[in-house]
């Protein structure tokens, strides 16, 4: 009896694992083995596929074959008993195009109100992703074990910290990788769960802000208790993108080691141009807090986020405010090539009751004013990037009197 060739051959590639699966074409014939050949582009001869010769099952692994993953290859399979079937040719494919990203490796670290997630590629020193190792981004789904309400977090890197969690609570999460440059989305890791610790005696410092004064940076934060000492550390932000189990070498800011106030001042030349992460820790001599939330600090934005300049056109019941670019010392406007949002505060000159308007536009109407009344206005700019969370200082207040009634047209 003639053996039929196997059908429906599927090639599954996950990271560096190459798996072939196929269907037997004749279940009634026993003791059949299967063998594969492969052929590279531009070659005429077929080569035996190591790891996939005389296979008794309907699955084989040819991961040991050292292929150029960007080069197209063709496979063929036949069945063998006393005689052999005809060859069945599989459509040619390029391994890299066919490959899926496998589940990443995940390590979790618990604090009282935070979890640190360390993510690394599932396959160490992968050949498939050798040129893309630095391009991996990750996304995760996290939920409280007790509620199951899921929160998705996109576009994270190999170390990510989730804050504002509850102490002594079990959280579960799963992570998948993506290579956006190749439009590839990976498969999720297994679910990992971790319980946050009992609440720490000392909370971490909060509301960290950086401002510029003269040639110095001024770092300020809030703290619940008095008589504490604080230390501040920095890290290059790009290091968070490093793949694998990286050693994050947080560095001390010399002028911010063991400070006894909730601020520290250090020279601008401590940092070269770049984007940094800053964190603060509190200690009372016996106990130490966990580190604060890490804030992103961009020296470019920090140095040049100046207060906005504005003109006021006064009407009887409103002001029209036109916001322009801030001026440098030489009276030349500063080009700010990142999106800003403006906070405008106004009040009646004779009162302390302030009102606030937040606006993205550079022309703003301040409504509901009384005629012939002096109002004062000040403004500041904020970056729209949540992570940078930068604000200029307020401009000087400008005071104007509204026009008499019926001039609003």
């Amino acid at each position: 009896k003639n053996l039929k060739s196997p059908q429906k051959v599927e090639v599954d590639i996950i990271d560096d694992n190459f798996i072939l699966r196929w269907n037997r074409s004749d279940e009634s014939v026993g003791n059949v083995t299967f063998s594969f050949d492969y052929q590279k582009t531009g070659m005429d001869n077929w080569i035996k596929l190591s790891g996939c010769q005389n296979i008794t099952s309907t699955k084989c692994n040819f991961s040991s074959l050292k292929l150029n993953v960007y080069e197209e290859i063709k496979l063929r399979i036949r069945a063998e008993k006393e005689n052999t079937s005809s060859w069945y040719e599989v459509d040619s494919f390029t391994p890299f195009r066919k490959a899926q990203i496998g589940p990443p490796e995940v390590h979790l670290e618990a604090e009282d109100k935070a979890i640190v997630i360390h993510i690394s590629p599932g396959t160490k020193d992968s050949v498939m992703w050798a040129l893309d190792g630095l391009s991996f981004t990750y996304s995760l789904v996290i939920w409280k074990n007790s509620s199951g309400v899921e929160e998705r977090i996109e576009n994270i890197y190999s170390r990510h910290k989730i804050y504002k969690l509850s102490p002594e609570t079990t959280y579960c999460l799963k992570v998948k990788a993506a290579l956006l440059t190749s439009w590839k989305i990976g498969v999720y890791s297994p679910v990992h769960c971790i319980k946050t610790t009992v609440e720490n005696e000392l909370p971490p410092p909060e509301n960290i802000e950086v401002s510029v004064q003269n040639q110095n940076y001024v770092l300020k934060w809030d703290y619940t208790y008095a008589n504490m000492t604080f230390q501040v550390q920095w890290l290059h932000a790009f290091l968070k993108r490093n793949p694998g189990n990286h050693l994050y070498k947080w560095k001390q800011i010399p002028d911010c080691e063991n400070v006894k106030t909730t601020q520290c001042v250090f020279p601008q030349n401590v940092f070269q141009k770049g984007i940094y992460l800053l964190r603060v820790q509190a200690s009372d001599g016996n106990n130490t807090s966990f580190w604060s939330e890490e804030i992103k600090f961009d020296t470019e934005i920090q140095a040049f986020l100046l207060p906005p300049v504005f003109n006021i056109r006064s009407l009887s019941d409103s002001f029209h405010i036109y916001i322009g670019a801030p001026k440098q010392s030489g009276n030349t406007p500063v080009i700010q090539d990142y999106p800003l949002i403006y906070e405008i505060i106004f009040w009646e000159n004779t009162s302390n009751a302030e009102r606030k308007i937040i606006e993205k536009k550079t022309d703003v109407t301040v409504p509901n004013l009384k005629p012939l009344t002096v109002y004062c206005v000040k403004a500041r700019a904020h970056t729209m990037d949540e992570k940078l969370n930068k604000s200029s200082v307020f401009s000087d207040a400008v005071c104007e009197k509204t026009k008499p009634g019926n001039t609003s047209k």
Epitope: L108, E109, I194, T197, N245, H246, L247, F290
Partner: antibody, heavy 119, light 107 residues
């Protein structure tokens, strides 16, 4: 293969100084922190301090401040521990160890160097 | 400094038994705790990091657990080669500190 090869045993007089070495192979010390640990019979393990070989930044346990000095030479992939003003309390085995990931503590250790302080 | 207390200086067990070595931190150290095994005349061998993760090559009969201030190293199905001293260590804050060690003796 990762290895930390420590220098040989030392017999030194009280008041003298000694410099121990730890030569790494199989990895670049610039990509790690190098730690030193003291072990005394019946006293267990004591952490001395660590150095970042990339820039020389150090951290010491308060007890070893002034007693121990950590240095590193990246060209020879070697970390050093200098102990000064030696007394019988410094008689111990000293280990170097590396930290190469923020996940780990010390994942590879040297074989230890025995220091005996005696007149 | 954070004090790591291993209250049991020594423990006696039999081959095949399950034994738990405990360690208490004087303040919350999250999960930044490591465990080491040390045999006489040898350097410490890392077993566990981040309180519960095994280093590669460590047999799965070694299990770490705990967070905050209370940590446990459990050895299930104890083997004769597990006769050693076990140390916990915190690496949440400098200075890093070790527990005093627990000697495991085989009956």
């Amino acid at each position: 293969e990762v290895q930390l090869q420590q220098s040989g045993a030392e017999l030194v007089k009280p008041g003298a100084s000694v410099k121990l070495s730890c030569t790494a192979s199989g990895f670049n010390i610039k990509d790690s922190y190098m730690h030193w640990v003291k072990e005394r019979t019946e006293q267990g393990l004591e952490w001395i301090g660590r150095i970042d070989p990339e820039d020389g930044e150090t951290n010491y346990a308060p007890k070893f401040q002034g007693k121990a000095t950590l240095t590193a030479d990246t060209s020879s992939n070697t970390a050093y521990l200098q102990l000064s003003g030696l007394t019988s309390e410094d008689t111990a085995v000293y280990y170097c160890a590396r930290r190469v990931s923020s996940l780990y503590a010390m994942d590879y250790w040297g074989q230890g160097t025995s220091v005996t302080v005696s007149s | 400094d954070i004090v790591m207390t291993q209250s049991q200086k020594s423990m006696s067990t039999s081959v095949g038994d399950r034994v738990s070595v405990t360690c208490k931190a004087s303040q919350n150290v999250g999960t930044n705790v490591a465990w080491y095994q040390q045999k006489p005349g040898q350097s410490p061998k890392p077993l566990i990091y981040l309180a519960s993760y095994r280093y590669s090559g460590v047999p799965d009969r070694f299990t770490g657990s705990g967070s905050g201030t209370d940590f446990t190293l459990t050895i299930s199905n104890v083997q004769s080669e597990d006769l050693a001293e076990y140390f916990c260590q915190q690496y949440n804050n400098y200075p890093w500190t070790f527990g005093g060690g627990t000697k495991l003796e085989i009956k």
